[in-house]
């Protein structure tokens, strides 16, 4: 059918409670394009009916709420007067229990669930809301252990929790919950994080953070297109040069003859108090030498890599 | 909890500098976040005058950006604001707030300043 | 400069009535709308962020809709505790601009 496929990285939610998921790739969404979503290469769009359990809005899929049966690779294809992608997101649906403390550890939790604090300084924990605007987020209510957070320590700032003078005790279980309501119905969004407490002086100065990549491996079939964003918080006054390395050497400098592998034009959006930069690495088509390279994120002295691998064998 | 406290004279000279700082407790202005002025002119509207970011940067409403300073002093875990060359037109309910990621989430009680002779 | 324009600036209404405000940018502000609320002698309370999200404390019958260039308020059960002047913001583009305010007023 024409369409590029491009591969997103796993998303691992709770059952039993809202998630939405918005199609934009920026290099391709920001022109005129339709957004379509299927799931698990049904020839059938997803519905539209904002009464559907499972919709499209605008660009965004929106289950309401998530269950158990919705696990699965679920497609949106973007299209433009010239383009044609498909975008892969592998959705997989645990059941919670976030206050039950016989449940083991939650399995690969992304790192919107596992944050940071650092001892001794005044840091913020964020509650990841991520739903269209047809949805309506009340406030956000915190909780540490299973008992909500009062205390002259703790401000609800928006979407995040202040913590002035973090102390070892800070460390545990915490949940952010919001009621989300839409079309006259209320449904309950409550976010676990796993805090741990670390004595590094944290973010700040010129000292770069990259957001993703995590140093980790991304499964990837072989002849696919990939297209990887590396995200960094940075200082808005800073220097740092942001680039994506293989062999200690520029992308666009390795691959200069095939020009196979590409780095992106870097984008970022100011927050007021820091800048989130993007710049991606497009794997035009994955070949069998991609696998097991470390690809290198770098923005100044902080670095986070990719390793691509195959896909395990399916013997279904 | 996180407080703000304005204070600075009530009452300046036109063409004189009025000079004001906002107190912060609960939360250190170096870890993060936007810290900014805003005023209010008597029965008027709002309008954002600038910030200082945690980082120490900062920027100004493109309208008074010729007259404004806004500086810190972390030891002490204060802000200030500083306008030149006022007149009457400034005379307002001077705010500080803090700005996180999208809004101005808490704010001070507020400061009137008049400007008169 | 983003100029935002809201309306009405000043409406009188029961106990109990539904009132909606709006509030037109005069450029797109994906989406980084936020509404206010000030009662007189006191400084402005964040009542709703980011266009859709309720701020600590706010009750429901505040209800937000919106994208693209234009905004509405509504509060769907006005009660004598609502009485105030409300302001919508921009936090899109610098500088950071307001409406020119919303009187609520009981008949």
């Known amino acids: 059918d024409g369409c590029k496929d491009i591969f997103m990285k796993n998303e691992i939610l709770s059952a039993s409670q809202p998630f939405a998921f918005n199609c934009t790739f920026p290099p391709i969404t920001s022109g005129e394009v339709s957004v379509t979503w299927y799931k698990n290469s049904s020839k059938i769009p997803v519905s539209k009916i904002i009464q559907s359990r499972i919709h499209q809005d605008e660009t965004w899929i929106l289950f309401l709420p998530m269950e158990w049966g919705d696990s699965g690779v679920y497609q949106c294809v973007i299209k433009g007067r010239d383009s044609c992608h498909r975008i892969h997101v592998n959705l997989t649906v645990f059941e919670k229990h976030w206050c039950d403390t016989s449940i083991g550890g939650l399995p690969n939790l992304s790192d919107e669930y596992k944050q940071i604090l650092h001892l001794g300084k005044d840091d913020s924990l964020t509650c990841h809301l991520h739903f269209p605007k047809s949805c309506v987020l009340g406030p956000i209510k915190w909780y540490k252990d299973c008992n909500e957070i009062k205390g002259e320590r703790f401000t609800v700032l928006e979407t995040r929790l202040l913590v002035s003078n973090v102390s070892a005790e800070d460390r545990g279980n915490y949940a952010c919950q919001a009621i989300l309501t839409h079309s006259g119905k209320q449904y309950e969004v409550l976010n676990g994080i796993t805090v741990s407490i670390t004595e590094r002086a944290g973010y700040g100065g010129s000292v770069p953070k990259i957001i993703y990549p995590k140093n980790h491996s991304i499964e990837v079939q072989l002849g696919t297109t990939l297209i990887v964003d590396c995200n960094v918080t940075d200082t808005k006054d800073n220097t740092n040069l942001r680039c994506w390395r293989v062999n200690n050497t520029l992308v666009d400098d390795y691959y200069d003859e095939s020009k196979r592998i590409r780095e992106g034009v870097e984008t970022h959006v100011s927050f007021r108090e820091h800048n989130l930069y993007t710049v991606n690495i497009t794997f035009l088509e994955v070949k069998m030498e991609d696998y097991g390279l470390p690809f290198m994120c770098h923005a100044g002295v902080s670095t986070a890599y990719i390793i691509l691998q195959l896909p395990a064998p399916d013997f279904r | 909890d996180l407080q703000f406290q304005e204070s600075g004279p009530g009452l300046v000279k036109p063409s004189q500098t009025l000079s004001l700082t906002c107190t912060v407790t609960?939360?250190?202005?170096?870890?993060?976040?936007?810290w900014n002025w805003i005023r209010q002119p008597p029965g008027k509207g709002l309008e954002w005058i600038g910030y200082i970011s945690y980082s120490g940067d900062t920027n100004y409403n493109p309208s008074l950006k010729s007259r404004v300073t806004i500086t810190r002093d972390t030891s002490k875990n204060q802000f200030s604001l500083k306008l030149s060359s006022v007149t009457a037109a400034d005379t307002a309910v001077y705010f500080c707030?803090?700005?996180?990621?999208?809004?101005?989430?808490?704010w001070g009680q507020g400061t009137l300043v008049t400007v008169s002779s | 400069d983003i100029q935002m324009t809201q309306s009405p600036s000043s409406l009188s209404a029961s106990v109990g009535d539904r009132v909606t405000i709006t509030c037109r940018a005069s450029?797109?502000?994906?989406?980084?709308l936020n509404w206010y609320q000030q009662k007189p002698g006191k400084a402005p309370k964040l009542l709703i962020y980011y266009t859709s999200m309720l701020h600590s404390g706010v009750p429901s019958r505040f209800s937000p809709s919106g994208s693209g260039n234009d905004y509405t308020f509504t509060i769907s059960s006005l009660q004598p505790e609502d009485i105030a002047t409300y302001y919508c913001?921009?936090?899109?583009?610098?500088?950071?601009?307001f409406g020119g305010g919303t009187k609520v007023e009981i008949k």
């Open positions: 707030a803090i700005r996180g990621p999208y809004s101005f989430t808490y």
């Open positions: 913001q921009q936090g899109h583009t610098l500088p950071w601009t």
């Open positions: 609960g939360y250190s202005i170096t870890a993060d976040f936007a």
């Open positions: 450029q797109w502000i994906n989406n980084y």
